[in-house]
Structures are given as C-alpha cells and as structure tokens.
Interface confidence: low
Amino acid sequence: FEIALPRESNITVLIKLGTPTLLAKPCYIVISKRHITMLSIKSGERIVFTFSCQSPENHFVIEIQKNIDCMSGPCPFGEVQLQPSTSLLPTLNRTFIWDVKAHKSIGLELQFSIPRLRQIGPGESCPDGVTHSISGRIDATVVRIGTFCSNGTVSRIKMQEGVKMALHLPWFHPRNVSGFSIANRSSIKRLCIIESVFEGEGSATLMSANYPEGFPEDELMTWQFVVPAHLRASVSFLNFNLSNCERKEERVEYYIPGSTTNPEVFKLEDKQPGNMAGNFNLSLQGCDQDAQSPGILRLQFQVLVQHPQNESNKIYVVDLSNERAMSLTIEPRPVKQSRKFVPGCFVCLESRTCSSNLTLTSGSKHKISFLCDDLTRLWMNVEKTISCTDHRYCQRKSYSLQVPSDILHLPVELHDFSWKLLVPKDRLSLVLVPAQKLQQHTHEKPCNTSFSYLVASAIPSQDLYFGSFCPGGSIKQIQVKQNISVTLRTFAPSFQQEASRQGLTVSFIPYFKEEGVFTVTPDTKSKVYLRTPNWDRGLPSLTSVSWNISVPRDQVACLTFFKERSGVVCQTGRAFMIIQEQRTRAEEIFSLDEDVLPKPSFHHHSFWVNISNCSPTSGKQLDLLFSVTLTPRTVDLT
C-alpha cells in the first residue's frame, strides 16, 4: 500500500490496532522490513507499507483526520471529499474525522444528502455499520451531539464555535463519498439546531446532547421538524431526567408557525403535544445548576408522524360550481386564549395546502380534508348574495333560502349561513315566507330550537335588527322594505337532524314604505310574544313597523303590552301607535311619547298594530314587547 498526503492538506492518517481479538496469530504493519503496530502519516509524507497477515481488517483500524481551520483564514465550505480516496486505502475499518474550528460568532452547518441520518442511543449499532458521530464545542469542552446511522430524517445540524464529525465505515463498505457538506451560517446563539425532515409517515428518536450523560448547564438546543402539511406529528418523551436548578427552570418550548401563543412552554413532565399539522420547532432549555448537587438534565424523545386518523382521512367534495356569489369559510371557533398548548386544527384544500381557516368560493368544485383531533373546534360560516338589479325581471321571483345538502354533509358544524338579499332602491321590497311558521325569540319565550334566523338590515348606514326567529311559532311572513341579511345560525349539533325544518323562501315584491311588516297567525292555546326591532337599542329614528294579526272567526285575541309607558322621549317628531280593526277600519291612536300604553284589549277580528318612532333623545329609546293570546269566543258578536 502507498499513502501520500499532500503538503498543507492538514490530514493525518493513523493506522492502529483495533479492538483486541482472540486470534492466536498476531499481525503487524511492515515498513522497510520493520514490524510495527501503529503507523502515523502526516501532511507532506509518502509511506509505502504492507501487513504481515492475510486479513488485516481483523486486527487494524485506520483513522483519517482532517483539521479545518476557520479561525485564521477562509473556510473551505461545500461538499466534503473523502481524502485520501477510499480506493487508495487498505481495506480496514476506517474512520474519517473532520475537525472544524471556528469563531464563536460563526455558525457551521452540516448538510446531509439523502439518505438522511437517524440518531441512535447508547448500546445501539447501525445495520450497515456506517456511523456518524458528531460533536461540538463549548469553549474547551467537547459536547457529543449524537451518533447517527443512515436512512433517517436528520438533514442538517447547525453548530457554532466548532464541529467534529467522525464517519465510520466498515472495511467491506463500498462508500466513497462523505455524504455531507459544510456551510457557514450566522451565529445560532445556542448549542445546536438539528433539522429533521419527514417526507411521509415515520418516526424519529432524538436525544439531548451528551445523552445519556447530562446536557450542558444553562444551554439551549433546538430541533426543527419539517412535516408535510397533510400529516400529523406527535411528540412523546421516552426518557428524561431533571437536574437540580438554582436559577431558571428546565423546560421545553414549542414554536408552531401560525400559533398565537408562541412559544408554547412545557415542563418535561407534562404531556407533550400531539396532532400537530405542519412544521414545528422544539427547544430544550437547561438551567443554572446547584454547584453542590447538580444532577443531570437529559432527554430522549420520539416524534411520530402519521396520517391523521378517522375523519381526517376522508376527502370531502364541496361542489359550489353551480352556486353564484357564495363563499364558505371553515374557521376555528372563538375560544378563550390559553397558554396551554392545543394541537393544531387545520383544514386542507386538495390535501396539500392546510391552514387554520379556509374560504371556498362559488363557481368551483373543491376537495377538502381535515387535520384536526377534534372537529368541534371548527365551524363553518357561509355567505351568499342574492341580488336583483332589474326590478322588472325580479318582481314576484322567489328563491329558496336553504342550506345546500353537501354543506350539511361536511363533518364541521355550520355556525352561520347568511343570505344577503339586495333589491333596487325604492323599486322592490322583500317578503320572507318560512316553511314552518316562526317564533320571535324573546326573554319571555326564548327559542329552544337548534337554529334560528337572524334578520337584519343590510344597508351599511342603517342599524336595524329585526330579531331572531325560530320554527314553531305564529309568524307567517316577514315583509321588509329594503336590503336585508338573513342568517341561519345553528345552536346545537342536532341541527343536522333538524335541518329538514329549515326552509325560508324570499320573494321580491312591489316596494312599500314601512321598514317591516310581520304577518302573525296565532295558534290557539299559545301566547305569541312580539317585540319591536332593535330590542335593547331601540327602534331607529323615524322608523315604522307593523304587525298584521289574524284572528279566526271563532276566537278572540287579547293584546297585552308589558309596560305602562313606552319610555321614549322625542327630540323631534312624534312617536305613535295605531291599532286598527281590519274589518271596520276603526282605529285607536296612542301617542307613545305621552300616553300610557293601552290596557289589555280584546279583538274579535283581524287587526293591525303599527308603531312609528320619532327622533328620540339618546338613552330614551322605543322598545315595546307585547303578546297576543287567542281564546274561544263565548258569544257570537257578528
């Protein structure tokens, strides 16, 4: 064999006896007829030698060390070569060592080409015998980062101040490349950063520096995990010890892109997070240890990356290709901010782009899936605009305000489905006709259904909320003067079962001047509660609303107001109420800003209640609540 090392290559080759074997016959290195058991070759030297036995690999090992000095001159960055070439070396178990020294302010990055590295613990060995031992430096102290095999997830290791990389190749291994390159980086301000890349499902076991011995005092080590968006990562601690801290606290911190509470801080004894979608970082922070009884901090943990379970494996098709002017947003329900870690909950488009919220628009067919441990953490909000621009075309036209079935089949609860109904100003008005008569939600008779319709003006300058209405009441239809939004809001998961009860038809009708008209057909045996729009804030200035209340021939209606006075104080104009019998046109007019509200009155025929507001002074608003109760007539008054 001949080994020639170029001058100033900073390479030293050492051939020495390996682990002693029980072989009876010894073996020697032979140079110029001299028999020796160790040979050192330095830069600029050329040595020819041989062995005294047929199988030197059973006796000797070879170490090739290259010192790279980044302190006094430029650093030779880039792909690291195996020098001398393995083809020129004797077939011994060989270890290539690269010792890089750099300033504390310089970061050094080892980049591993595929196959990436897999960390092994004490007592473990690599199946192919190829091992990578990596250590760093804190001042004069060497810190073992870890021992690694091939076929893993570790793609990069960043350190500063220096790095020692030892690549051990068994004598029979044909490898002739180092498999890594070195790059310079800015200071990382910590012991090291290990990047672990998952292409698909898999797991990685990783350890703190110096494991199973103690992690250096008051140091920081970070692992960066790159996880495809459609997969989920879970962290579990396999083994850890805590040292005795004098100052600070030993902890792990998670940094999750998109989280509002980064970093998420955990004690080592806490249950660690699972079900994380996408990339994340984990950092181990040591403390100032007690000088007398330091103890040791060490951590061995596993990251498991897998396809999400159950619901999350499914692909849902949301076909909005035949919809117009509609958007569907899936987003997190509002929750109280908590410092406690909550696993990510994501919705994915085409299983690739995952985010905490997603908006789908009409005109396309969308494929979505979920990355979420608990889909009740998400809800859906949908907006659809139905607009009429040409009153001649729209008049008398009807549209069904119905939640499309494919939206109901998504595994996420529908929160709001809002229809924005737009009409040409002063040309058309709207009428809402429910499939089932509606009840107005009041404190006295609250809705207890799984959903309600919230009806409000959709004119930006107008603050007018007509109320919340649910199925099972006496309101047969609601007419409104101009643009409104109707929002179907769900209150319970049982909405899925009750979805058949939803059904509201909107029709464009000739324009009328009142803000709203409620047609009420009370049922016998039940008290109908009705209240003016904008309850709690007061009917807007100069607004007029009416109730058309039907009374069957064999019944009498009792109209009751729940206050003695309206409480309104007018700044300008008058507030009044008209109660008019529809058959005789006889009417009573009450000045709401002056008069006492009428005592309970009985009506044998259908009648109108019309309330018109003045411009009230602030704080003295017009809010009225009244009820209608039917009872059988005892005497025929016709």
Partner: antibody
Framework: QVQLVQSGSELKKPGASVKVSCKAS????????MHWVRQAPGQGLEWMGW????????TYADDFKGRFVFSLDTSVSTAYLQISSLKAEDTAVYYC????????????WGQGTLVTVSS | EIVLTQSPATLSLSPGERATLSCRAS??????LHWYQQKPGQAPRLLIK???QSISGIPARFSGSGPGSDFTLTISSVEPEDFAVYYC?????????FGQGTKLEIK
C-alpha cells in the same frame, strides 16, 4: 363514448343474495358519482342512494338501509350493488346512473338489470 | 324529504300538439329539478337539467321552466317518438326523489 354496462338478468329465491355489476367505460370512474335507481314492474323510479367513487363512501336512502350494499372496484371501473336476504318485493329493474356529486342529474344510465325474486 | 307530484298522470295528445307536463314540489327547491324520458324497456334519458337548462343532443322542442316549487316541461310540438313516460327528479336534498311520472300517450 360514455357507457354503463350492467350485468344480465337474475332469477333468485327469497332469502338469497344477488350482486349486480355496472361497468363504466369512456370516462374515469372516479370523476363522477355513481347512483342506483330501482324500478318495480309498472312502477316509477326510486332513488336508492349513491357511492362516492373517489372515497368509496356509500350513502343510502332510508328505504334501502340494511340489506343493500354499494361497492366499487376502481381497478376494473366497476360499481356493484349487492342485495341480501332477497324478498319478493325486491323484484325490479335496477339501474346504475352517472351523476354529479351532491347535485346529481343522471346524464348516463346503464341498460338496467332485472332481478326477479320468486320461490 | 321533497315530495314531487306530477300531473296529469296521463296526457293524451295527437302528434303536432303542444304538451305541458307539471311537477310540483312540496317546498321550494330553487332550480334543483331535472326531467327524464323513459320508453318501455329502456333506461331513462336526461332531457332537461336545473329546471330549464337544455341537454346536448335533446331536440329543441323540449323546454323547462322553474325555479321554485312549480315546474313545467313543455314539448312544443309532439312527435311520434315522444310518446313515453316523463319523470321529474329533485336534486335539492337527500334523499333525491322522483315524481310518480306522467304518461304521454297517443290520442
């Protein structure tokens, strides 16, 4: 051109099972949903349900839950309808039809398979 | 579920006459209604989709109206090959349903 070709007529005894196949050609099976429709002799059409050809998830109309199973073999572009514990009232022509997911109009139909259940 | 009621059950016309077939839904189903023609011993054939949209290859004499809850299929001038049973179908919500059919027969 698009074709749905169904298996031939079947005569079965009550209590037996039958499996009707529907082979799709001229398009990619997984691009459209597959629906099953029943027509009893001299009667109208009854929608039985559908199978999502992308995920294999079936949806059954209430009257067809239990004894009816929709399945797929995408490798041979074929959808199947299996009926177990056959009854005389299952005697009908069964059609497969191609539809749009969640909003189906059935633009192509199989020729129908007559299943007769008689002792 | 949406119940579709077709009328009349039978319509007797001579070739060249105008046919008007009605389909009424138990509630408003917007334009989620399709029409099919079925001849004896044959599978149904799609005629009209989404209440009024025409289908490629279907003669122009077939037209539909909607949306809402009342739908009409019109054959402007009946040809001999049009005598068949016509079904409307709701695609509004599960379960998808068919009307009971209208038989168009030769007078």
């Amino acid at each position: 051109q698009v074709q749905l070709v169904q298996s031939g007529s079947e005569l079965k005894k009550p209590g037996a099972s039958v499996k009707v196949s529907c082979k799709a050609s001229g398009y990619t099976l997984t691009d459209f949903s597959m629906h099953w429709v029943r027509q009893a002799p001299g009667q109208g059409l009854e929608w039985m349900g559908w199978i999502n050809t992308e995920t294999g998830a079936p949806t059954y109309a209430d009257d067809f839950k239990g004894r009816f199973v929709f399945s797929l073999d995408t490798s041979v572009s074929t959808a199947y309808l299996q009926i177990s514990s056959l009854k005389a009232e299952d005697t009908a022509v069964y059609y497969c039809s191609r539809g749009r997911d969640y909003d189906p109009h059935f633009d192509y139909w199989g020729q129908g398979t007559l299943v007769t259940v008689s002792s | 579920e949406i119940v579709l009621t077709q009328s009349p059950a039978t319509l007797s016309l001579s070739p060249g006459e105008r046919a008007t077939l009605s389909c009424r839904a138990s509630q408003s189903i917007s334009d989620f209604l399709h029409w099919y023609q079925q001849k004896p011993g044959q599978a149904p054939r799609l005629l009209i989709k989404y209440a009024s949209q025409s289908i490629s290859g279907i003669p122009a004499r077939f037209s539909g109206s909607g949306p809402g809850s009342d739908f009409t299929l019109t054959i402007s001038s009946v040809e001999p090959e049009d005598f068949a049973v016509y079904y409307c179908q709701s695609a509004h919500s599960f379960p998808y349903t068919f009307g009971q059919g209208t038989k168009l027969e030769i007078k």
